[in-house]
Structures are given as structure tokens and as C-alpha cells.
Interface confidence: medium
């Protein structure tokens, strides 16, 4: 069965407001869920659609949402079908509608002394309250010969007579809102000694130090009396003006005239009219002073060509409104057409390459005129002035591969180098045209390049392949200075690479043949047994037919490697006491001793009172401190190789002799005790 | 996230006017009503209208309507509710909160604006 | 307007006690009833909408129920952090109305 879990209730819904009618249902199988407004299926549209098996309201209309509502659901397999509850809205609004005469029949019949009734036509739901005005002022019931009818939404006048004439307003209110009539009625009851408006003052908005004229006119028997009065209710004559107003000329038709207008006269002025009998009408205008504010710059633009754009033109703050419109060329843009103007927008429909330029915007008022520029550049699809070629590159030099392109706005160009984005570094750089620069080939640039050139319109590539012309080199070069141990086997590798695999020998540099004991091996010197004759100055040749041939000199020295004679030990002193750390080595070059305590190296020229290094390589360390403590390592080195050996030295208090223990009991560690 | 600020507390005379207002960010300010709830001090909520930030058009409670006024300024995403004629019993925080998208109830509340009405 | 009348005015629970508030509509207002929780000198809380519908980050110990003119709040364990003022209102009908308040205690 087709159950409810929440059925949509009636509920108060306000004109214009979203709303949601809620429904929820469960089934044993798949249902769908459709809505009925007065037994007719609710179509979605925008307003008004289904929100799951809710009905929602994006804005609530009295008239198409009046009636009763229906949530139904369906099993479409078995065809069962459940009705929710009905609910309805009880919609709120209220509508602005004018003050109109309703008795009598018609304007031209009302007469001192006789029943005036107004109806004004705001109407809503709930029924509003009403709330009548006389030239703004609000009207109290049963107050000055007039009634009103809440119920019937009249005012009525009996009798109604001059002191009633005046403009004639309403609003209403309700729980919805309020609303004020669209249209007002002004009722005009003549009393020949009232005064009546014939010509009222109108707002102005001048130009600084231009001219500003206010008309004002009153018409009644005797005559009326006329006064002008300026914002602090300063009165203007032509006898006493304030000192702000100086240049203020009051005619006698009742008109105002400033000259020379300055911020100073901006401001309200008032017009009063004074006749025999009832009250002043009090008349106001307000004097603008016309001001244009500076546009703000536009950002260039690029289009594409093809496109739609729009550019809109933010008027300057200004009084009056600035009129905007745009040029190009000098000429103003029409409305219409391919490239026009509308409202504040610069419109550019299927944008040509001729389009392109500079645009402005104008904007104009009493105050001034401003202007400002745009530039529009149509972007193009780059073409190719030089695509990159096939290059061989040489090793070790600067390469060049081209991407010359043009388009509007100039392209970018950026390459790859096995489809990897290539960044500039210190080998690489591409220059404003596009060129790439490889700084010093080296071999494995040999590989694939792609450059693209862009814009926005577009983009174009093109790749190509280097090789690499790979120069004659030793790979890698032979040590100048090598060493080999006296009656030790010994080789000397020499290695190259070029464009063609090269051929390598060795020679002696003083062109001797080599002895038959020293081999030349595909370029390694071979010595089965090095003896003192061996040493000297020896050249490695590589050659091919291409590239001719390089040259590598080696001296080769014969050395007896360092070993030691004599090597420190771990060592043990009492505080105070003298340590000797010794060390002697043996080799050809006759090597030099350094000592490293403590992780630094201690120079023979540097140490102070307390140590010294002999001419054997021992270390004494006079008056042992505990911070003497430590590994100290003795260091043999010749030009031809380097050998350490290390030992740690450990400084104790001395113990003061127990009464058990007799004058000559041996310490429990070995110990240097000077 | 969403965030409603309100601004500090007002002491006012009785018959002044006070100005509060709600800066709303996290959200798109146009999508959700704006709603004013005041709560005196020891007593309970009480709802004083709400307007729709898209279109400028408040609804308020009729208790209100002649003296408050509420209005929104889009370019800043700030909403604000005007009480005229204050009296001594108008002392009360008053909250802006974000309505859901029915403006039915509130998922989101500014911190409150102390306003106290005393001669 | 529809007046929200909520029962009991002031309620102590054991912790880990289920709490029962009550909140009754003076009209049919079908499912349109929200609570919120309030603590002292802090703004209200949501705790449930539409009667009977979850607030994503809210503890699920709260739950709603109820149509027309009755509507419940439960709090199936009170926690010490649940001592609060508890407000439901309705968005059935302009203006919009709030309860009194019901005040939980810790017994």
C-alpha cells in the first residue's frame, strides 16, 4: 500500500514569495509522484516545479496558484494510486491603485459647500488599512469636516470647502505590506482670497557659475503675497539678501534668479504664497550643483576574431545622469549594425581583424565632458615565418633552433624537448622571436624539439630533431699527474669518443719506445712491474680520419706507498701529566706527519705552549687537562698517497693512595706517568 | 564558511532611531532572506520581518511595520533593519539570521546587537 | 497570528535520561514547526526543521516529531552540554511566532 509519510498542508503564502508544498510518500515497489491543482496536472516550469515529491514555489501568483492542491501517487505497476490530503495557499498581496473621485460624477461639478467622497484603489488580501494624506499630512477621522470609511476605503468631505483643496493621497497596510496609490487626486476648491499655485518652482541642476532661475507664481483676491526663503529659512529680497546669495535677483512675477551659481547656493528654496485668508502654500525646489567624476581606465582588450564581445562603459558618478556614448575613428557608434552601441555597452558581433583600434567612451553632462580610452586588439592565429629544422648541432658550442611566427597580439612561444616543457635555465633560453638557444650542446640533446607559438585566437607547431655532432674528447680525460707503486702491477687508462670511434696509443714524451715490460692495450698503459725507470712524462694520442687527433700528457711518478713504522696507541694519562702520542711513517716522496685531535687539524705553527709535534711525527701534550680527552689521529701523506691511523687518549684524576694498598700497587690501566 | 557580523551595541534615547546592521559572507548574499529576530533581556524570541536580499522587498511583522525599515546594499553584502521611535521596551538584542532557501527557519545567526533604549 | 504555546516551562532530567518537550500550535500548521536550542549570552541554534528533519551537525540524540497542532522535541540522552533554552517556531503564517521557551535542567 501507498502511504504518506507528510502530506502538504494549507498555509498563508505571501505574493512573489517562495513557498513549498511538502510531499512525502512510501511503497512497497517504485511509485512516481505528480501534483494536481484543481484535479488538472501541475506542469513544472521555472516558477512553479517539483522539488522530489515536494512542490516548490520559487515566487507564490494569487492567480495561478489559486485553488486547491493535490499530491498523487502511482504504482504504475499495479496501478494503485493514493490522493493526499487537499491543501491550499491563502495568499497574501497587496496592489497600488490611484485616489479617484467618486462623487460627484466628475470634477467639474464640485462646488464650495458640497459632499466630496474619494475612493482609493489599493486592494490586497487580507483587506488592507487605509490611511489618508492632504499634501503629505496624514488625516485623523472625524478631524476638519471629513470621514473615513475604512471599510468602504473613502474619504469624504461635507461640506468640502477651499481650506479642503490640496493633493490627495493613500496607503494601505496589511500583514503582507504596504502600498501607496499610484496616482493622487487633486482636489481644487476655489476661494478667490486663498492663494493658489499658478506656476510652482522646479528642481534645477546647473553648471558652476552659470545661471539658475526658479519660477513662482500665486494667484488669488486681493492679490497674494510672495516670499522666497533659502535652506536656513534665510529670507531673499532684493533689499536683504544673505551673504551667500548676493548674486539672487527676486522679479516681480515672483521669479528667482541666481548668477554665478557656487556650491555655497546649493540647496532647498522655498516659495511662499500668502493670500487674504487660509493657509501659506509653501513650495520647494532644490538647486543641484552639476558635477562629473573622473572614468576609471579600461584594461586592453583581446578579442578573437569570429566572436562576440561586449565592453561596457561605467558612467561617471555625475549630476545630472552623464549621457554616455562610444566613438572609434572620431565617429560616434551607431545603435544597430555589426559594431554598435547598447545602453553603456561597446557591442562587437563576428569580430573582423579590422575591428581593431582604439574605442572611447564618452560621458557628458551640464559639468563636463569625460573620455576614456580602450584598446582592442582582434587576436589572430599565428602563421610561420621560419619553422625549426632538422639540425645538426656540434658538442661543446651554442646551437640555435628557429620558431619565427607572426599574429596579432605577438605570439608566445614555447618549446619542448621530448614533450617535456622546457624551462629556462642556464643552458637553455628562447628570445623574444621565438629562437631557441641551447648554450653548450652537450650529446644527449640529440633528441626531439616542438615549439608552439600562441595567441588567443589560436596556436601552430612544428617539431624537429637534432643530432648531435659529438667533437673528439677523452672520456674522461687522463689525471695529469698519476702515481703508481714502485714494483707493483699498474695501469693507466686513456679513453676518447668522437664522431668516428678513435683510435688511441700511448708514447713516451721524449719519443723512447716503451719497454717490453709496459704494454699499450686499446689505451691502457699496462705496467706488469713498475720500477724507477718508469716514471716520467708520457702522451695519449686519439685520432680518427674526420676529426684528426688529440693529445693528453701524464707525468707518471713511481712512489713507495706510505706505511707506518711506528703507530700511536691507546693511551692513558693522569691530569697533569705529560702524554706522548707517537707516529712514524715511511714511503717515497718521504711523507709529512699531520696530527688531527679533537676533529680538527692541529697546526704545527699554532699550538701553543703545552704541545708539539717532533720531527719524527710524535705528538707531546704537556700538563694533560680532561678536556684533552679524545681520538687524535696521525696523518702520512706524500704527492702520491695519504694514510691515517688513529688512537684515543684518555686523561683520569689520580687516585690518592688507600691505607690497603702498599706504595708500589700498579694502576689498574696501562699509563704514561712522567 | 558562512558567516553573519553584526554591528556593536547602541545606547539610545526613547524616541531616536537605531540602525543595525549584518554583513553576510561565505555565501552567495543574494540566494537567502535576511532575517531580524530580537530577544529582550530574560524573555523570549520574537520575529520582526525579513527581506529578500535579490530584490530588495521586505515582509514585516505587522507589530513593527510602522518603525522598522529593513534594506540590503548588494556591493557589500550587508543587510540592515532601521527602528524609529525607540522606546524603553525596544531594549533587547536583536539578531540577523540566514534563512533556508524558503526563508522558514534559520540555520545561521549573526552574534547579536545589544541596542539599549534609556533617558 | 498562531500562538506556540510549550510545555513544560522549565524541565529536569537525569543525565542520560530521555527529555520530552512539547510544543502546541493554536491552528493546523501541518509540519511547519522548527526547534533551536539557546545558551546563556549565545545566539540560537537549529536543531531540527520541518518537525521532524535533521541539521547535518547536530548530535543525532535530537529528534522531532509530530503534525498539525502538536509537535515534540526528544532528547534521547541528556549530555551536561544539552542545558539549554529551547524555542520551536512556526513558518506556516506570517508573522512568523516563536514559544516561550522551555528551560532543562540537569536533575
Known amino acids: 500500500a501507498i502511504v504518506f509519510i507528510k502530506q502538504p498542508s494549507s498555509q498563508d503564502a505571501l505574493q512573489g514569495r517562495r513557498a513549498l508544498l511538502r510531499c512525502e510518500v512510501e511503497a512497497p515497489g517504485p511509485v512516481h509522484v505528480y501534483w494536481l491543482l484543481d484535479g488538472a496536472p501541475v506542469q513544472d516550469t521555472e516558477r512553479r516545479f517539483a522539488q522530489g515529491s515536494s512542490l516548490s514555489f520559487a515566487a507564490v501568483d494569487r492567480l495561478q496558484d489559486s485553488g486547491t492542491f493535490q499530491c498523487v501517487a502511482r504504482d504504475d505497476v499495479t496501478g494503485e494510486e493514493a490522493r493526499s490530503a487537499n491543501a491550499s495557499f491563502n495568499i497574501k498581496w497587496i496592489e497600488a491603485g490611484p485616489v479617484v473621485l467618486k462623487h460627484p460624477a466628475s470634477e467639474a461639478e464640485i462646488q464650495p459647500q458640497t459632499q466630496v467622497t474619494l475612493r482609493c484603489h489599493i486592494d490586497g488580501h487580507p483587506r488592507p488599512t487605509y490611511q489618508w494624506f492632504r499634501d503629505g499630512t496624514p488625516l485623523s477621522d472625524g478631524q476638519s469636516n471629513h470621514t473615513v470609511s475604512s471599510k468602504e476605503r473613502n474619504l469624504t468631505l461635507r461640506p468640502a470647502g477651499p481650506e479642503h483643496s490640496g493633493l490627495y493621497s493613500c496607503c494601505a497596510h496589511s500583514a503582507f505590506g504596504q502600498a501607496c496609490s499610484s496616482q493622487n487626486f487633486t482636489l481644487s476648491i476655489a476661494d478667490e482670497s486663498f492663494a493658489r499655485v499658478v506656476l510652482a518652482p522646479q528642481d534645477v541642476v546647473v553648471a558652476r557659475y552659470e545661471e539658475a532661475m526658479f519660477h513662482c507664481q500665486f494667484s488669488a483676491q486681493p492679490p497674494p503675497s510672495l516670499q522666497w526663503l533659502f535652506e536656513d529659512e534665510t529670507p531673499i529680497t532684493n533689499r536683504s539678501r544673505p551673504p551667500h546669495l548676493r548674486r539672487a535677483t527676486v522679479f516681480a512675477n515672483g521669479s528667482l534668479l541666481l548668477t554665478q551659481v557656487r556650491p555655497r547656493n546649493a540647496g532647498i528654496y522655498r516659495c511662499i504664497g500668502q493670500g487674504q485668508r487660509g493657509p501659506p502654500i509653501i513650495l520647494e525646489a532644490t538647486l543641484h550643483l552639476a558635477e562629473i567624476e573622473d572614468m576609471p581606465l579600461f584594461e586592453p582588450r583581446v578579442f578573437t576574431a569570429g566572436s562576440e564581445e561586449r565592453v561596457t562603459c561605467l558612467p561617471p558618478k555625475g549630476l545630472p545622469e552623464p549621457s554616455v556614448w562610444w566613438e572609434h575613428a572620431g565617429v560616434r557608434l551607431p545603435t544597430h549594425g555589426r559594431v554598435y552601441q547598447k545602453g553603456h555597452e561597446l557591442v562587437l558581433a563576428n569580430i573582423a581583424e579590422s575591428d581593431a583600434g582604439v574605442y572611447t567612451c564618452h560621458a557628458a553632462n551640464l559639468a563636463g565632458q569625460r573620455r576614456q580610452d580602450v584598446n582592442i586588439t582582434v587576436a589572430t592565429v599565428p602563421s610561420w615565418l621560419k619553422k625549426p629544422q632538422d639540425s645538426q648541432l656540434e658538442e661543446g658550442k651554442p646551437g640555435y633552433l628557429d620558431c619565427l611566427t607572426q599574429a596579432t597580439p605577438k605570439p608566445t612561444v614555447v618549446w619542448y624537448r621530448n614533450q617535456m616543457l622546457i624551462s629556462e635555465d642556464s643552458r637553455f633560453e628562447v628570445f623574444k622571436n621565438g629562437t631557441l638557444r641551447i648554450n653548450s650542446v652537450e650529446v644527449y640533446d640529440g633528441t626531439w624539439y616542438r615549439c608552439m607559438s600562441s595567441t588567443p585566437a589560436g596556436s601552430i607547431e612544428a617539431q624537429a630533431r637534432v643530432q648531435v655532432l659529438e667533437k673528439l674528447k677523452f672520456t674522461p680525460p687522463p689525471q695529469p699527474q698519476q702515481c703508481m707503486e714502485f714494483d707493483k702491477e699498474a695501469t693507466v687508462p686513456c679513453s676518447a669518443t668522437g664522431r668516428e670511434k678513435p683510435t688511441i696509443k700511448w708514447e713516451r714524451a721524449d719519443g723512447s719506445s716503451l719497454p717490453e715490460w709496459v704494454t699499450d692495450n686499446a689505451g691502457t698503459l699496462h705496467f706488469a712491474r713498475v720500477t724507477r725507470d718508469d716514471a716520467g712524462n708520457y702522451t695519449c694520442i686519439a685520432s680518427n680520419g674526420p676529426q684528426g687527433q688529440i693529445r693528453a700528457h701524464v707525468q707518471l711518478t713511481v712512489a713507495v706507498f706510505i706505511t707506518f713504522k711506528v703507530e700511536p696507541e691507546r693511551t692513558t694519562v693522569y691530569q697533569g701529566h705529560t702524554a706522548l702520542l707517537q707516529c712514524e711513517a715511511q714511503g717515497d716522496p718521504k711523507p709529512l706527519i699531520q696530527w688531527k685531535g679533537k676533529d680538527r687539524i692541529l697546526d704545527p705553527t699554532k699550538l701553543g705552549p703545552r704541545m708539539h709535534i717532533f720531527q719524527n711525527g710524535s705528538l707531546v701534550i704537556h700538563d694533560v687537562a680532561p678536556e684533552d680527552s679524545g681520538r687524535y689521529t696521525c696523518i702520512a701523506g706524500n704527492s702520491c698517497n695519504i694514510k691515517h691511523t688513529e688512537a684515543p687518549l684518555y686523561v683520569v684524576d689520580k687516585p690518592v693512595p688507600e691505607e690497603s694498598e702498599g706504595p708500589g700497587s700498579p694502576p689498574p690501566y696501562k699509563m704514561i706517568q712522567t | 564558511q558562512v558567516q553573519l557580523v553584526q554591528s556593536g551595541a547602541e545606547v539610545k534615547k526613547p524616541g531616536a532611531s537605531v540602525k543595525v546592521s549584518c554583513k553576510a559572507s561565505?555565501?552567495?548574499?543574494?540566494?537567502?532572506?535576511i532575517n531580524w529576530v530580537r530577544q529582550a533581556p530574560g524573555q523570549g524570541l520574537e520575529w520582526m520581518g525579513d527581506?529578500?536580499?535579490?530584490?530588495?522587498?521586505?515582509v514585516y511583522n505587522q507589530k513593527f511595520m510602522a518603525r522598522v525599515t529593513m534594506t540590503v546594499d548588494k556591493s557589500i553584502n550587508t543587510a540592515y533593519m532601521e527602528l524609529s521611535r525607540l522606546r524603553s521596551d525596544d531594549t533587547a538584542v536583536y539578531y540577523c539570521?540566514?534563512?533556508?532557501?524558503?526563508?522558514?527557519?534559520?540555520?545561521?545567526w549573526g552574534q547579536g546587537t545589544l541596542v539599549t533604549v534609556s533617558s | 497570528e498562531i500562538v506556540l504555546t510549550q510545555s513544560p516551562a522549565t524541565l529536569s532530567v537525569s543525565p542520560g535520561e530521555r527529555a520530552t518537550l512539547s510544543c502546541r500550535a493554536s491552528?493546523?500548521?501541518?509540519?511547519?514547526i522548527h526547534w533551536y536550542q539557546q545558551k546563556p549570552g549565545q545566539a540560537p541554534r537549529l536543531l531540527i526543521k520541518f518537525a521532524s528533519e535533521s541539521i547535518s551537525g547536530i548530535p543525532a540524540r535530537f529528534s522531532g516529531s509530530g503534525s498539525g497542532t502538536e509537535f515534540t522535541l526528544t532528547i534521547s540522552s541528556l549530555q551536561s552540554e544539552d542545558i539549554a533554552v529551547y524555542y520551536c517556531?512556526?513558518?506556516?503564517?506570517?508573522?512568523?511566532?516563536f514559544g516561550q521557551g522551555t528551560k532543562l535542567e540537569i536533575k
Open positions: 517556531q512556526q513558518s506556516n503564517n506570517w508573522p512568523y511566532t
Open positions: 527581506i529578500n536580499p535579490y530584490s530588495g522587498g521586505p
Open positions: 491552528q493546523n500548521i501541518g509540519t511547519s
Open positions: 539570521a540566514r534563512g533556508d532557501y524558503y526563508g522558514s527557519n534559520y540555520n545561521y
Open positions: 561565505g555565501y552567495t548574499f543574494t540566494d537567502y532572506y
